[in-house]
Interface confidence: medium
């Protein structure tokens, strides 16, 4: 049990100590108490280094002292001879005696109490790392302001964890910068910025001092970054070992200080700040960014505008702009959207004429129509180039995406004719000299092709037969023949409102305006052996001369027979219109005097019997255009006459031009518009 | 003609998970971001997140991180939607959908039913 | 997050009538707002997207308008299959964010 004070004394003391002993003492004062050991009285037989007989006292395995010889107190006052002070509450007390004493030695008295020891400073080491505070039996440890004291009881550390910075700029530095840092303490600081930023950390050199790392290189004290799974770090020494620039890519940064025990250095500081997180800026060829930066960075927001001709298509539709936004990951929000070309798709196909196959439908692509050559050319004079427009239209070079029109071309037999000049006497033709002639079956009757879906006829052929069945194509109008022709139907016949129409039409005086048109129910296709005649222009170069020739055909009566089944032809030249006044009309239905000329007709033939008759009315009188030599108009239709083979009337198609074109055009065929 | 074809229903015990998927045809998923959208009973539309099958990029609605997870597999051209930790507040039905500039095309729904 | 706010969960209107649906976002998101029409039992169908746009086949008695934080869905003559649940959708910034929807009932 320990004791607070106690007596030793040496064997048979104050007697003579016996030869031969060795006997030893445990001294034991309470915790916290050190212990007083002092002598009052040592006579024990001197040798050097006390070899012989001795008092050893031992704290542990650490010698204390060892006495030998005689002492006596320098102090009139006390009787202390000898003493040991130690900051232990245990101490061994081990007396020896070796085999023989030359005289005889009394030993020694000694006494020991507990006393009280000052921890603060009775030690090398301090046993608290900030404040000690001494006390009899003991000692406790305080600590700064700000500090607090560690489950040790002994070491104070700074309670620097916890503190999270979410603000876009700051400033974080060790406890107590630019002062030492506290000993045994771990710091942690947590950056938490909202999404879309990313840490960066600066430290300046001269803003680091931390304990240098040991010779093996571990760092004793350390600063350590962590960002999700990167880390900086450990640093340590004297300037700051790392980069000045900390770019974590996170938006998230924790900060570890970890110190050990000792240390004097002042610590470090460092700036922080959140970086909007970058886009890449993509240079593109195909669109416009608005606004226009050198850098975009989280929250930015840009129209993205595609250049004219490109879209961007999404399901079955197409939009030019769209916007996109810099997002918390650094990608663009909407980043599949790409302005790609406009795609035009197939061309549309024309009637009577052809497209090419596009090498692309893209963009900026080029197709070319075509009409069928020679029947066909393109109306308005285009050269057929189209081009996919930004629109997504194929356009014209006016930029109009109206398909080019193939119309038939007028007036050009493939064949010229070169038989007699006569119909009456009989001159075969082939169709492939009158493209344009069309045969009426009832009456028997001709008639000019002038337009796909239009026939010109004279007014006294249709006149009782509104629903005529027409042909085109065939020389022959034998029936077998006729079956392989192409048949024509009526949708509508239009009378000139200037025809009068008689209740007995074969006692007509009058054939003044005996012109009408046929409209089709569907369009002619032309061919070698059918094609349109041409319109008279409304100059005076379509003015008919005297001895101007012409060309009628038909099958009408010859003079063999009262109905040609093949095709006849004749070259005939205008006449003054008092010739056909001076013939003696046949007629015994009307009144020869009663016959009424106009301007609106023609007068033509009177030579070696050459004429047009009963079965070729509505024929075309055609003549071969002033300004296209190569083209034949129709000049008049084949009307009435006095008698066959003489001269023949012919209505003077030029009049009536302005009523042709009005009617073909109000009355157009809907899917051709 | 495009077209999501989503699997069939499911019914699950709390604290398991689920995976549905999305196959696509009439297009290659690679050149759109593929979407997924939960509808709880009676209730409105909440994005999940979306996947860019091309690069395997997601991004959640955060209040899915962690409860749902896109996948893709371009060779089959179908998205994955993987739910775990099922509670009955993920009792919904879930679309797929396509975009690039808005959700042109939707999958027919597959309904997941969480109940013990 | 955007908050988009469809004010009216339910309207009921009759056959034949104008009705009109709102919708507001808690911020700027220009024009990038889209109209979904859901049927009983079905997913959701597109009408509207930027705001303004009728997307294809989609007839042309429904119309959008609006930028900035207000937009507007019309149904300018009310038909009996148009019965249904209309949703406005921002697609500005994930996440993508939609309205509660609006329920037309037919008189």
């Known amino acids: 049990e320990p004791t607070m004070y106690g007596e030793i004394l040496s064997p048979n003391y104050p007697q003579a100590y016996p030869s031969e002993v060795e006997k030893s003492w445990d001294i034991e004062v309470p915790e916290g108490y050190g212990i007083h050991l002092y002598f009052t009285h040592l006579d024990i037989e001197l040798s050097e280094n006390c070899a012989y007989d001795s008092v050893q006292i031992m704290s542990g395995d650490i010698e204390e002292g060892r006495l030998c010889g005689q002492r006596t107190s320098n102090n009139p006052h006390s009787p202390i001879v000898e003493e040991f002070q130690v900051p232990y509450n245990k101490l061994q007390v081990i007396f020896k005696s070796d085999f023989s004493n030359e005289e005889r030695f009394t030993g020694f008295a000694a006494y020991y109490v507990a006393t009280d020891i000052n921890e603060c400073t009775d030690f090398v080491d301090a046993p608290c790392s900030h404040f000690c505070n001494n006390f009899i039996g003991g000692y406790f440890c305080s600590c700064p302001p700000e500090y607090f004291l560690h489950d040790d009881m002994k070491n104070c550390g700074v309670n620097c964890s916890g503190d999270v910075f979410t603000a876009l700029i700051g400033e974080i530095a060790s406890p107590n910068y630019p002062k030492p840092y506290p000993e045994n303490s771990r710091c942690e600081y947590q950056i938490r910025l909202e999404k879309g930023f990313q840490v960066v950390v600066t430290v300046r050199r001269e803003d680091f001092d931390v304990e240098p790392a040991d010779s093996e290189g571990n760092c004793l004290d350390s600063l350590v970054f962590v960002a999700g799974d990167q880390q900086f770090g450990p640093y340590c020494g004297r300037g700051f070992p790392g980069p000045l620039n900390i770019e974590t890519k996170s938006n998230a940064l924790d900060i570890i200080f970890q110190t050990d025990l000792t240390g004097q250095n002042k610590g470090w500081k460092l700036r922080y700040h959140g970086d909007p997180m970058p886009c890449p800026k993509e240079e593109t060829p195909t669109s416009v960014w608005e606004p226009a930066k050198a850098k975009y960075v989280f929250r930015d927001v840009v129209r993205i505008t595609c250049l004219d001709g490109f879209e961007v298509v999404e399901g079955r539709v197409g939009a030019t702009s769209f916007h996109s936004t810099c997002q918390s990951n650094g990608k663009w929000s909407n980043s599949k959207l790409k302005c790609q070309p406009v795609d035009c798709g197939i061309p549309e196909s024309i009637e009577n004429g052809k497209v090419e196959d596009p090498e692309s439908t893209l963009f900026g692509s080029v197709t070319r129509y075509t009409c069928e050559e020679p029947y066909y050319y393109m109306e308005n004079g285009g050269n057929g180039q189209y081009h996919c427009a930004s629109n997504g239209s194929w356009v014209n070079e006016a930029l109009s995406p109206e398909l080019p029109k193939c119309v038939p071309v007028c007036g050009v037999p493939r064949e010229p004719f070169e038989g007699k000049q006569r119909i009456i006497g009989g001159s075969d033709a082939d169709i492939k000299n009158f493209p344009w002639q069309v045969f009426f079956d009832n009456p028997w009757a001709g008639g000019a092709l002038i337009d796909e879906y239009w026939v010109l006829t004279a007014a006294h052929v249709v006149e009782g037969n509104q629903e005529p069945t027409m042909y085109v194509g065939s020389t022959s109008v034998q029936t077998s023949r006729l079956a392989k022709s192409k048949m024509l139907t009526s949708e509508r016949v239009f009378i000139h409102p200037g025809w009068k129409l008689l209740e007995v039409p074969e006692a007509r005086t009058n054939f003044d305006n005996d012109i009408a048109l046929v409209q089709l129910k569907d369009p002619v296709k032309m061919g070698p052996t059918v094609a349109p005649i041409c319109l008279p222009g409304t100059s005076s170069d379509y003015n008919l001369m005297d001895g101007d020739l012409g060309l009628i055909a038909g099958w009408g009566r010859t003079e063999k027979r009262d109905r040609a089944l093949r095709l006849k032809a004749a070259r005939l030249p205008v006449a003054p219109l008092r010739k056909c006044r001076e013939v003696k009309v046949e007629n015994p239905k009307a009144d020869a005097g009663a016959y009424v000329f106009t301007p609106n007709m023609i007068c033509a033939g009177g030579e070696k019997g050459m004429d047009s008759c009963k079965g070729d009315s509505g024929g075309a009188f055609a003549v071969q255009d002033p300004n296209d030599k190569a083209k034949f108009y129709v000049a008049g239709l084949v009307s009435w006459g006095p008698q066959c083979g003489t001269y023949g009337l012919y209505t003077r198609v030029q009049n009536y031009v302005d009523w042709i074109k009005k009617t073909m055009q109000e009355n157009s065929t809907p899917s051709k518009d | 003609e495009v077209q999501l074809q989503q699997s069939g229903a499911e019914l699950v015990r709390p604290g398991a998970l689920v995976k549905l998927s999305c196959k696509a045809s009439g297009f290659n998923i690679k050149e759109y971001y593929m979407h997924w959208v939960k509808q709880r009973p009676e209730q409105g539309l909440e994005w999940i997140g979306w996947i860019d099958p091309e690069n395997g990029d997601t991004i959640y609605d955060p209040k899915f991180q962690g409860k749902a997870s896109i996948t893709a597999d371009t060779s089959s051209n179908t998205a994955y939607l993987q739910l775990s930790s099922l509670t009955s507040e993920d009792t919904a039905v879930y679309y797929c959908?396509?975009?690039?500039?808005?959700?042109?095309?939707w999958g027919q729904g597959t309904l997941v039913t969480v109940s013990a | 997050d955007i908050v988009m706010t469809q004010s009216h969960k339910f309207m009921s209107t009759s056959v034949g009538d104008r009705v009109s649906f709102t919708c507001k976002a808690s911020q700027d998101v220009r024009t990038a707002v889209d109209w979904y029409q859901q049927k009983p039992g079905q997913s959701p169908k597109l009408l509207i997207y930027s705001a303004s746009y009728r997307y294809t086949g989609v007839p042309d008695r429904f119309t959008g308008t609006g930028s900035g934080t207000d937009f507007t869905f019309t149904i300018s003559s009310v038909q009996a299959e148009d019965l249904a649940v209309y949703f406005c959708q921002q697609q500005y910034t994930t996440p993508y964010t939609f309205g509660g929807g609006t329920k037309l009932e037919i008189k």
């Open positions: 959908a396509r975009s690039r500039l808005f959700f042109a095309y």
